[in-house]
């Protein structure tokens, strides 16, 4: 009596249990009675992951410089091309098919999180007591001048963009 | 220790200005910012602003600017706050305080003036 | 301007009940830089000034009673009193000093029953 299912890594196939393809491999022929089933090496340039009974293996991704990309893992029979950005650029999706370059983060505000091949600039504001005066994807928040470490005293309130003005203790109001 | 005195109540007229005192003891006066801060009955505390008495540097909340203008003198360690064009609207409790540490770190108010009820009525 | 958002806006308790009251502010209060939260609570009572009680959102100022805890990070706080006191009867205010202009929130008023 025919197999009404078969086992891990083989599948059924006129009324037989044939064997998969093991991974960098695709499908010849299917099995008979007579022979195993037959596989063939995947060709340069392209891979199959897993046990399988496809035909055809499937292309390495190409990493295109026009969009940004390039190379971080090279494909394998068994595994695909991984693609990350180039510096200064991030990943627009999980799969990585484009880039962007990396926000800055405006006067006001810091960087919270430097950006990666992946993930984008976190910038967040500077809070009181930190400043911060350029557009910049590296620089955080920096602290106000301590006018009183230098014997001085502030002259001008500091902002989030701008730092305290230090002057001379001289002033009587 | 530290002590802010504000004078006790101001009934002025519309359109008139009042200056309001807030006298410092105990620490080094002009090291540390003096906020002012609203209370009205029912919209409960505003922030005014705040002045650095040793170099006279002021920060105003931009829904006071115009109205409220804030002075030091360090020979009197006092600190005052004129309010000008006076409405009804400016019938509050002012009160002023002083943050725990100097300039750098914003301010939480560790030490509060017992107040100062400015009444505005024709 | 960060807006701070307090509720409830009343509450009335049994002494000896514990009692929480929320504060959420409209941006994140927690600078990464430092790790804090810019965040106060104070007390005030009837006829006086307010009482600082809370700073860096879980800081206990010096002489206030350790049933006064406040907690929370980003933008959702909170002030909780382990075991009410008559005394306690108050409005409590959370404050954001993270940015210019400071802000407080609208109170919360703690009745006793």
């Known amino acids: 009596e025919p197999p009404t299912a078969c086992s891990d890594k083989q599948y059924l196939h006129d009324g037989q249990c044939c064997d998969l393809c093991q991974p960098g491999s695709r499908l010849t022929s299917h099995c008979t009675a007579l022979e195993k089933t037959q596989c063939h090496p995947c060709d340069s340039g392209e891979f199959s992951a897993q046990w399988n009974r496809e035909i055809r293996c499937h292309q390495h991704k190409y990493c295109d410089p026009n969009l940004g990309l390039r190379v971080q893992q090279k494909g394998t029979s068994e595994t695909d091309t991984i693609c990350t950005c180039e510096e200064g650029w991030h990943c627009t999706s999980e799969a990585c098919e484009s880039c962007v370059l990396h926000r800055s983060c405006s006067p006001g505000f810091g960087v919270k999180q430097i950006a990666t091949g992946v993930s984008d600039t976190i910038c967040e504001p500077c809070p009181v007591g930190f400043f911060s005066n350029v557009s910049s994807a590296f620089e955080k928040c920096h602290p106000w001048t301590s006018c009183e470490t230098k014997d001085l005293v502030v002259q001008q309130a500091g902002t989030n963009k701008t730092d305290v003005v230090c002057g001379p203790q001289d002033r009587l109001r | 220790q530290v002590q802010l005195q504000q004078s006790g109540a101001e009934l002025m007229k519309p359109g008139a200005s009042v200056k309001i005192p807030c006298k410092a003891t105990?620490?080094?006066?002009?090291?540390?910012?003096i906020e002012w801060v609203k209370q009205r009955p029912g919209h409960g505390l505003e922030w005014i602003g705040e002045v650095l008495p040793g170099s006279g540097s002021t920060n105003y909340n931009e829904k006071f600017k115009g109205k409220a203008t804030f002075t030091a003198d360090t020979s009197s360690n006092t600190a005052y706050m004129q309010l000008s064009s006076l409405t009804s609207e400016d019938s509050a409790v002012y009160y002023c305080a002083r943050p725990y540490y100097r300039y750098d770190v914003g301010a939480w108010f560790a030490y509060w003036g017992q107040g100062t009820l400015v009444t505005v009525s024709a | 301007d960060i807006v701070m958002s307090q509720s409830p806006s009343s509450l009335a308790v049994s002494v000896g009940e514990k009692v929480t009251m929320s504060c959420k502010s409209s941006?994140?209060?927690?600078?990464?830089?430092?790790?804090?939260?810019?965040l106060a609570w104070y007390q005030q009572k009837p006829g006086q000034s307010p009482k600082l009680l809370i700073y860096w959102a879980s800081t206990r100022e010096s002489g206030v009673p350790d049933r006064f805890t406040g907690s929370g990070s980003g933008t959702d706080f909170t002030l909780t009193i382990s075991s009410v006191k008559a005394e306690d009867l108050a409005v409590y205010y959370c404050q954001q000093y993270y940015s210019y202009p400071y802000t407080f929130g609208g109170g919360t008023k703690l009745e006793i029953k």
């Open positions: 941006q994140s209060l927690l600078y990464s830089g430092n790790q804090k939260n810019y």
């Open positions: 105990g620490y080094t006066f002009s090291s540390y910012w």
